[in-house]
Amino acid sequence: QQQTLPKPFIWAEPHFMVPKEKQVTICCQGNYGAVEYQLHFEGSLFAVDRPKPPERINKVQFYIPDMNSRMAGQYSCIYRVGELWSEPSNLLDLVVTEMYDTPTLSVHPGPEVISGEKVTFYCRLDTATSMFLLLKEGRSSHVQRGYGKVQAEFPLGPVTTAHRGTYRCFGSYNNHAWSFPSEPVKLLVTGDIENTSLAPEDPTFPADTWGTYLLTTETGLQKDHALWDHTAQNLLR
């Protein structure tokens, strides 16, 4: 006999990287008929929802109106049907951004390179942090972690046209508190026509919504804006 129900999906809207003082909603999707959902934060009960009527609802939302460092951390949810509880969801890492300072992102030898050239990004932040994150905008997110006292190097190696796109970096004060994003750096890689057609540039988002490509989600949930990429989430673990 089944002792637990399948785990729910958990994700953040609009995304798991939340600028300080902005709002975010944590969503938990279980099953129709669930009489109770519980949201846990860093291992402690955070909130409870008892849907009405339960047979018409399979998803609940937990609202955070004012993101800050106290709200950043790991969230999970569970649900109950009758007396039977589900497995806990995967962990959702909620990150607060726009903390303290803004790093500077530069690229060597420059933003316009030829396919096959070696390219290195440099992220610099003078305040006390030793971890840096380089993010490439687009539907398939590319995240690298780097370390250094005030600057981290991100060698991309010999680039292809697949490396084309817009990059930003963050300083990370801890796993869940990141700096302001750097100004964007657009990398233009020129190559032959055949390579270009094989490796089109990732679709990018307008500058004011650049973070939405890094939604924290899980496969199986049909949502247009849900981009099933765990790269950044896994980096936090």
Partner: nanobody, 127 residues
Framework: QVQLVESGGGLVQAGGSLRLSCAAS????????MGWFRQAPGKERDFVAA????????YYADSVKGRFTISRVNAKNTVYLQMNSVNPGDTAVYYC????????????????????WGQGTQVTVSS
């Protein structure tokens, strides 16, 4: 912006009853989930009870379940904590808190989930 003012605290004998009130000023009281927390000297602030913006559901700490009742009257912008069968372990400063929720069936248990706090009212239970 919501301002919260607690009242009703005082000295009560073990086994007795007390009703705490929390009056909210500001708009949209009915949109806020409300909670009561307590803090004994030298200890952390502990969850006591919470109520959703609609008044149902409610949620209680195990230590007060069956003894305390939380309720609200949105027309009066007030939330109440009825405390029965009190014991010396209930001695603490009691705080009222308010937090916005996405749904009217959500109760908030963790203090981080509340944006607004009252100044507190002292409850002392003598044996």
């Amino acid at each position: 912006q919501v301002q919260l003012v607690e009242s009703g605290g005082g000295l009560v004998q073990a086994g007795g009853s007390l009703r705490l009130s929390c009056a909210a000023s500001g708009r949209s009281f009915s949109r806020y989930a409300m909670g009561w927390f307590r803090q004994a000297p030298g200890k952390e602030r502990d969850f006591v009870a919470a109520i959703s913006s609609s008044g149902d559901p409610t949620y209680y700490a195990d230590s007060v379940k069956g003894r305390f009742t939380i309720s609200r009257v949105n027309a009066k912008n007030t939330v109440y904590l009825q405390m029965n069968s009190v014991n010396p372990g209930d001695t603490a400063v009691y705080y009222c808190a308010a937090g916005l929720t996405a749904r009217d069936t959500t109760v908030v248990v963790h203090p981080n989930g509340y944006s607004y706090w009252g100044q507190g009212t002292q409850v002392t239970v003598s044996s």
